[in-house]
Interface confidence: low
């Protein structure tokens, strides 16, 4: 679909520009596989200019396509501590509202020890996103090694 | 924050749409981990709009927020040399000026002979990337697999 | 090169904001390397707003410096299934017009079951895209662990 | 072909160490574990250990505080060293190539018969 | 860590199907697909037969494949031959990072 007549004049407000970079905070309790993320210049180069953390989860506050990436890097971690820890997987998805509930991005980490992906995937207002990390081994929280972050891009 | 009023209208130069995707020229002398880059039409598919290369690396002309992207393949390499020559890390970060010196992507091989990864970060006008190699492993200088580039997303 | 003067507004639909995420459809019968993808919102979470899909393969609609990004996760797999039916290898390139053939992003699995990475790159209306999947192991065709994807980044 | 050759004392004398090594040849020894097994008379197989070149091992927990495996990369080899031996570590020991790409012992030595008696 | 569990012995005649099984935990052989075989004739060193639960390494006749389901991984012999006559092991990765072979099964033909 195209999206107005061609010389419809763009507000800057619409342009959206909703962007967020986290840095990792903890993980979860037992039995919670979420990580727990953290923002803001106060603590680094991690930031949220639109979405809003709620408990240590992204909640997306404007309708749109984004990019969605993010990097894990295990700590004390060495390819054959990764294969004897399979399977270690983390996934990224839409956790609550439980009807939108749906996984995003996927990926096990076998015999490495970071994974790195990025996705674009339609987001609503009010979408919190949880990425769950299974298995043993605990994640890095260097800064330069563990991130997570989506950028609006598109209505 | 939010932007501006709702309503003010946004001019072209102001998008920023600084970006730039480069390919791997050489790497750096001994005690170097330096990635040396090269960009532009000529060589094929890289190119510079707006940030401009410095000796080999990356210098932005625009203050805002970046998605940095990067993949490294490394040369005559299986997953038994790439264990075997660990630890090999590609480390990204600001170089100069020195008073802003900090790493922002770090990833390990491992039993792997490619990295690739992306994030957002916020970059001044002035700011270098550096892409330190560290190991002894060569990197590929096929334009497919090597690759570093980034994208003005916001201000 | 700056794009215009300073003042010039920027209509709406000039901003481009092409951008397509596809799933996996099904592999190509023997002999033929390619992936087939498939895309809207019948089927999920995917969408094309500007390309298009031909015969599975991605054709772009519109000029411009996009960011291509793929993960392709190798079904029924191990690190040991990967090292044992290595090399298996995904290249992502221009396939058509013939004259403008050329390989963008090119990944082996080595020891891992999933590839993910993302570049720059020119495109012009009328290329499409292929991505070519090398090697005897399978694509997982879950969409949260293999996707396709483009977004228009600038003119 | 990769072929690994081991050798060592044959009869020690309680709490004395055993002492054997392994040598490869034929192949990369960088890019694999290798490890200690052994079997009694008459029994079943025990792991008793692993190394990589880098020198990062892996041990049995039941026979940790008695184990030693180094490796010496210069000759590719690896050798095990059981302390304060007793008459129930008399086995035949086999030095084997741990294959992590298959999750296995894929090559194995020829095997030591080591008896502790006094 | 306790050995795996397999039979002590088990037989059959030349021709016949025999199956031996190998029972772990959830912390080895019901977590990894780190499963090996292994055929041992007296007085030789064992011989890779089966990996990564039912993989065949080159040379080995495709009558011995191999299983798995939930915490128990079972080798079978199809075609029983008088050459097939030795002690059989299992083995497995754990999660601690160690290997635990089987106590051995030896088979007989009849």
């Known amino acids: 679909q195209r999206f107005a007549q061609a010389q419809q004049q763009l507000p800057l407000e619409s342009l959206g520009w909703d962007v967020a970079e986290l840095q990792l905070n903890h993980t979860g309790p037992q039995q919670d596989p979420r990580l727990y993320w953290q923002g803001g210049p106060a603590l680094g180069r991690s930031f949220l200019h639109g979405p809003e953390l709620d408990k240590g989860q992204l909640r997306i506050h404007r309708d749109g396509i984004y990019m969605v990436h993010i990097q894990v890097t295990l700590a004390i971690c060495s390819s054959t501590t990764a294969s004897r820890h399979h399977p270690t997987t983390l996934a990224v998805g839409i956790c609550s509202p439980a009807s939108r509930s749906i996984s995003l991005l996927r990926l096990s980490f076998h015999q490495g020890c970071t994974i790195a992906s990025q996705r674009l995937t339609p987001l609503a207002r009010g979408d919190t996103l949880c990425t769950n990390l299974t298995g043993t081994l605990l994640p890095s929280r260097n800064t330069d090694e563990t991130f997570f972050g989506v950028q609006w891009v598109r209505p | 924050q939010r932007f501006a009023q709702a309503q003010q209208q946004l001019p072209l130069e102001s998008l920023g749409w600084d970006v730039a995707e480069l390919q791997l020229n050489h790497t750096g002398p001994q005690q170097d981990p330096r990635l040396y880059w090269q960009g532009g039409p000529a060589l094929g598919r890289s190119f510079l709009h707006g940030p401009e290369l410095d000796k080999g690396q990356l210098r932005i002309h625009r203050d805002g927020i970046y998605m940095v992207h990067i993949q490294v393949t490394l040369a005559i390499c299986s997953s038994t040399t790439a264990s075997r020559h660990h630890p090999t890390t590609l480390a990204v970060g600001i170089c100069s000026p020195a008073s802003r010196s900090i790493s922002l992507l770090r990833l390990s091989f491992h039993q792997g002979c490619t990295i690739a990864s992306q994030r957002l970060t916020p970059l001044a006008r002035g700011d270098t990337l550096c892409t330190n190699l560290t190991g002894t492993l060569l990197p590929s200088r096929n334009t497919d697999e090597t690759f570093f580039g980034v994208q003005w997303v916001r201000p | 090169q700056r794009f215009a003067q300073a003042q010039q507004q920027l209509p709406l639909e000039s901003l481009g904001w092409d951008v397509a995420e596809l799933q996996l459809n099904h592999t190509g019968p023997q002999q033929d390397p390619r992936l087939y993808w498939q895309g809207g919102p019948a089927l999920g979470r995917s969408f094309l707003h500007g390309p298009e899909l031909d015969k599975g393969q991605l054709r772009i609609h519109r000029d411009g410096i996009y960011m291509v990004h793929i993960q392709v996760t190798l079904a029924i797999c191990s690190s040991t299934t990967a090292s044992r039916h290595h090399p298996t290898t995904l290249a992502v390139g221009i396939c058509s017009p013939a004259s403008r053939s050329i390989s963008l992003l090119r990944l082996s699995f080595h020891q891992g079951c999933t590839i993910a990475s993302q570049r720059l790159t020119p495109l012009a209306r009328g290329d499409t895209l292929c991505t070519n999947l090398t090697g005897t192991l399978l694509p997982s065709r879950n969409t949260d662990e293999t996707f396709f994807g483009v977004q228009w980044v600038r003119p | 072909q990769v072929q690994l050759q081991q050798w060592g004392a044959g009869l020690l004398k309680p709490s004395e160490t055993l002492s054997l090594t392994c040598a490869v040849y034929g192949g990369s020894f960088s890019g694999y574990y290798w490890s200690w097994i052994r079997q009694p008379p008459g029994k079943g197989l025990e792991w008793i250990g692993e190394i990589n070149h880098s020198g990062s091992t892996n041990y049995n927990p039941s026979l940790k505080s008695r184990v030693t495996i180094s490796v010496d990369t210069s000759k590719n080899q690896f050798s095990l060293k059981l302390s304060s031996v007793t008459a129930a570590d008399t086995a035949v020991y086999y030095c084997?190539?741990?294959?992590?790409?298959?999750?296995?012992?894929?090559?194995w030595g020829q095997g030591t018969m080591v008896t502790v008696s006094s | 860590q306790s050995a795996l569990t397999q039979p002590a012995s088990v037989s059959g005649s030349p021709g016949q199907s025999l199956t031996i099984s190998c029972t772990g935990t959830?912390?080895?052989?019901?977590?990894?697909?780190?499963v090996s075989w292994y055929q041992q004739h007296p007085g030789k060193a064992p011989k890779l037969m089966i990996y990564?639960?039912?993989i065949r390494p080159s040379g080995v006749s495709n009558r011995f494949s191999g299983s798995k389901s939930g915490n128990t991984a079972s080798l079978t012999i199809s075609g029983l031959q008088a050459a097939d006559e030795a002690d059989y092991y299992c083995n497995s990765y754990t999660r601690s990072g160690t290997w635990v072979f089987g106590g051995g099964t030896k088979v007989t033909v009849l």
């Open positions: 959830s912390s080895d052989v019901g977590v990894y697909n780190y």
């Open positions: 084997a190539r741990v294959s992590r790409s298959r999750g296995a012992f894929d090559i």
């Open positions: 990564d639960v039912g």
